[in-house]
Every structure is written in structure tokens, then in C-alpha cells.
């Protein structure tokens, strides 16, 4: 069964800067990745970035840099300034659309006791929704 993992890390150099990494553990080809915060896209969450393997990347503040890390994983750096900056308990969600598996989504947040610059290795987060 495909799985999605989400890792959230606070940068040591900028305490209000976050890095979100997400990956898809499955055999299908990725057709779209959506990163949102506050909940799943369209269900209480606000889209931060959309990544398509051929058509490119769209991102919106406070997202600073979204990129593909591998064919099945992405990373997103968030700028932390102003009213739209994330806080420690913000939930981030990643949705991977894959052929032929369908859509798989998982969410994660900063570990409660995490020190800036430190993070646990990525582990599969609970899958919220599979379309």
C-alpha cells in the first residue's frame, strides 16, 4: 500500500523559518504534489505550493522555495515573517497524486520537543485520505 511521509523542521538559523519535506512511498508515477497548511487542501487548509513534474512549480507566500528532491519527494522552505508566518503547532499536509494508485495525503507538524535544527528521520505519517 502506498504511503506518504511528512517531515517538518525548524531552521536553527532562522527560528521562524520552516522546512517541510514530503515523500511518496509507492510504485506509481507522481502527477502532482500539493503542500498546504492548516489542514488538507480545500478542507480548511491553504495551499502553499503545487508541483508538477513537467509543468513546473507554483508557490505562494510565505513559501520561499519549493523544489523536487527526488522523483517522489519534495521540499518546501517557508519564510517566517509577518502575520502569515507559521508557528510551532502549525499542521502541514502533502498530497501526492499518483498513477495508477490515486491520491494519497498525510499531514505533520513540528515535533513538540524538537530543538531548532534537529529533526527526527522522516517516517510515514498517518494517511488522512486516499481518493
Amino acid at each position: 500500500t502506498p504511503e506518504v511521509w511528512v517531515q517538518v523542521r525548524m531552521e536553527a538559523t532562522e527560528l521562524s523559518s520552516f522546512t517541510i519535506r514530503c515523500g511518496f512511498l509507492g510504485s506509481g508515477s507522481i502527477s502532482l504534489v500539493t503542500v498546504s497548511w492548516g489542514g488538507p487542501n480545500g478542507a480548511g487548509g491553504t495551499t502553499l505550493a503545487v508541483l508538477h513534474p513537467e509543468r513546473g512549480i507554483r508557490q505562494w507566500a510565505p513559501a520561499r522555495q519549493a523544489r523536487w528532491e527526488t522523483q517522489s519527494s519534495i521540499s518546501l522552505i517557508l519564510e517566517g515573517s509577518g502575520a502569515s508566518s507559521p508557528c510551532a503547532n502549525t499542521t502541514f499536509c502533502c498530497k501526492f497524486a499518483s498513477f495508477p494508485e490515486g491520491s494519497w495525503e498525510a499531514c505533520g507538524s513540528l515535533p513538540p520537543s524538537s530543538d531548532p535544527g534537529l529533526s527526527a528521520p522522516p517516517t510515514p505519517a498517518p494517511i488522512l485520505r486516499a481518493d
Epitope: 480545500g42 495551499t47 503545487v50 508538477h52 497524486a97 490515486g102
Partner: nanobody, 127 residues
């Protein structure tokens, strides 16, 4: 809950121009649909697709409006526009904004899967 609100309709003479706007709003969060599209329904006719634009800016148009209508979205991703030039009497209809998501981020054909709809704005082309 997501709401779509259209504006910009009205009465215009043949050959004239109008610009329609649609804003997607939601309580407590910002909704950026993968696809936003315009549909229209003329009196006594079925609703038909007019134009669609996806999150990456890719557009599709009905043959009847190609070269006359231009769909666009704002950079924030939640507003949709339709610039209508060289209007004809047969363009008279109620114009609806629709929005939704699709597996690959593109606009699905004929508006399939677009689960949010506006109330519509009337466009009348008459001399």
C-alpha cells in the same frame, strides 16, 4: 465552505466588450482551486463550457469563443477573470464561475469534478 462570487455582467452592444470576475472565498482559509472555469447558459439551452484555466495558467476555450474571450487568474490563485471582446447576440447568457480540483492539476473536460459553482451573472448583448 467555499463560495464563488461573480461580477461584471450587464448589457452591452454587439461588438462591445465586458470583463467578468469571480472570486473564490472560504471561511478561515484560502482556497486555491486547481481549476477555475467559466460556463454559460443561454435561455432555453443547456449549460456549456466557455473557458477554463488551471493552476499553472494553462487555458482551454470553447471553439465558439476562441480569439474573442481570454481567461486569466490572479497571482494569488483564487480569482478568475474573463475578458470578452467582439461580443455577439449569441453570447447572451448567464455566465457561471466554477472551481474544483483534479488529480493532475488540469481543468477536466466539460467541467467534470468542479464541485463549486457561483450564482451566475447575466450578460446581455443587444442593440
Amino acid at each position: 465552505q467555499v463560495q464563488l462570487v461573480e461580477s461584471g455582467g450587464g448589457l452591452v452592444q454587439p461588438g462591445g466588450s465586458l470583463r467578468l470576475s469571480c472570486v473564490a472565498s472560504a471561511s478561515g482559509f484560502t482556497y486555491r482551486p486547481y481549476c477555475m472555469a467559466w460556463f454559460r447558459q443561454a435561455p432555453g439551452k443547456e449549460r456549456e463550457a466557455v473557458a477554463g484555466i488551471d493552476i499553472f495558467g494553462g487555458t482551454t476555450y470553447a471553439d465558439s469563443v476562441k480569439g474573442r474571450f481570454t481567461a486569466s487568474r490572479d497571482n494569488a490563485g483564487f480569482s478568475l477573470y474573463l475578458q470578452m471582446n467582439s461580443l455577439r447576440a449569441e453570447d447572451t447568457a448567464v455566465y457561471y464561475c466554477a472551481a474544483g480540483d483534479s488529480p493532475d492539476g488540469r481543468c477536466p473536460p466539460l467541467g467534470q469534478g468542479l464541485n463549486y459553482w457561483g450564482q451566475g451573472t447575466m450578460v446581455t448583448v443587444s442593440s
